[in-house]
């Protein structure tokens, strides 16, 4: 299957019950600290507020945050990173009433509480050190 361009931007409309599904493979060995970044933008350009940033340091940790009024807020982290070196992953971000639920290969790793309403999200961007197979939104 051919790869998508990275960074990859996808216009979206999110609501409770939506799910963003990202499939890809890290392009570097974990010893080189490859990363995956997913941003939920509130408009179609990168200056807009970010309702949710999810950045994976493969083999290490995940950092999550949001940007409000152009200001980065309180960082949240988890060391539970069930990605495997060199193997394809499926990252699912479910939109629940109170949080984004993040699952990797079917395993829940975190719940990021909504601050900016999900209905404000207009674009998802996937970037950094991955070969990207697919990005889709289920409503």
């Amino acid at each position: 299957m051919s790869s998508l361009p990275v960074p990859y931007k996808l216009p979206v409309s999110l609501s409770v019950g939506s799910c963003v599904i990202i499939k890809g493979t890290p392009i570097h060995s974990f010893i080189n600290d490859p990363q995956l970044q997913v941003d939920f933008y509130t408009d179609m350009d990168e200056d807009s507020d970010i309702a949710f940033r999810f950045r994976v340091h493969f083999g290490n940790h995940v950092v999550m945050n949001r940007r409000e009024f152009g200001i980065w807020m309180l960082e949240e982290t988890t060391d539970y990173v069930p990605f495997e070196d060199g193997k394809q992953f499926e990252l699912c971000i479910y939109v629940h009433y109170n949080e984004y639920e993040i699952k990797v290969n079917g395993i829940r790793i975190y719940g990021f509480v909504h601050r900016i309403p999900p209905s404000f999200v207009k674009m998802v961007q996937v970037s950094r050190d991955i070969s990207l197979t697919s990005v889709c939104v289920c409503n």
């Epitope: 408009d43 409000e68 807020m73 309180l74 404000f120």
Partner: nanobody, 119 residues
């Protein structure tokens, strides 16, 4: 649809104080940061202050108002406040409140309240 209504503006002499209020309604925004912007005649709208909804409710200020303005919020009343002390002539502007998620675009700006500082 989000509705934001700012109030509390007025005419004050240099060195004086005012307290602005902004009540929000109409959307599930309670977790969003809330903030204040201002626009002086002939100038672009500029950031004044914002307050997060994190447990430690961090406050952020433009350099020009640090030490003089204090932002606070009352989540039970869905209201954000801006206490403005030691006002200067250059603080004269229309002040707008906003919720995050629409910055820097004017999707949900509140109706402004005019502040005039003059002797």
């Amino acid at each position: 649809e989000v509705q934001l209504q700012a109030s509390g503006g007025g005419f004050v002499q240099p060195g004086g104080s005012l307290r602005l209020s902004c009540a929000a309604s109409g959307s599930s925004y309670a977790g969003s940061a809330m903030g204040w912007f201002r626009q002086a005649p002939g100038k672009e709208r500029e950031f004044v202050s914002a307050i997060s909804s994190d447990p430690d409710t961090k406050a952020y200020y433009a350099d020009s108002v640090k030490g003089r303005f204090t932002i606070s919020r009352d989540n039970s009343k869905n209201t954000v406040y801006l206490q403005m002390n030691s006002l200067r002539a250059e603080d004269t502007a229309t002040y707008y409140c906003a919720i995050s998620g629409q910055y820097p675009y004017a999707r949900y700006w509140g109706h402004g309240t005019q502040v005039t500082v003059s002797s």
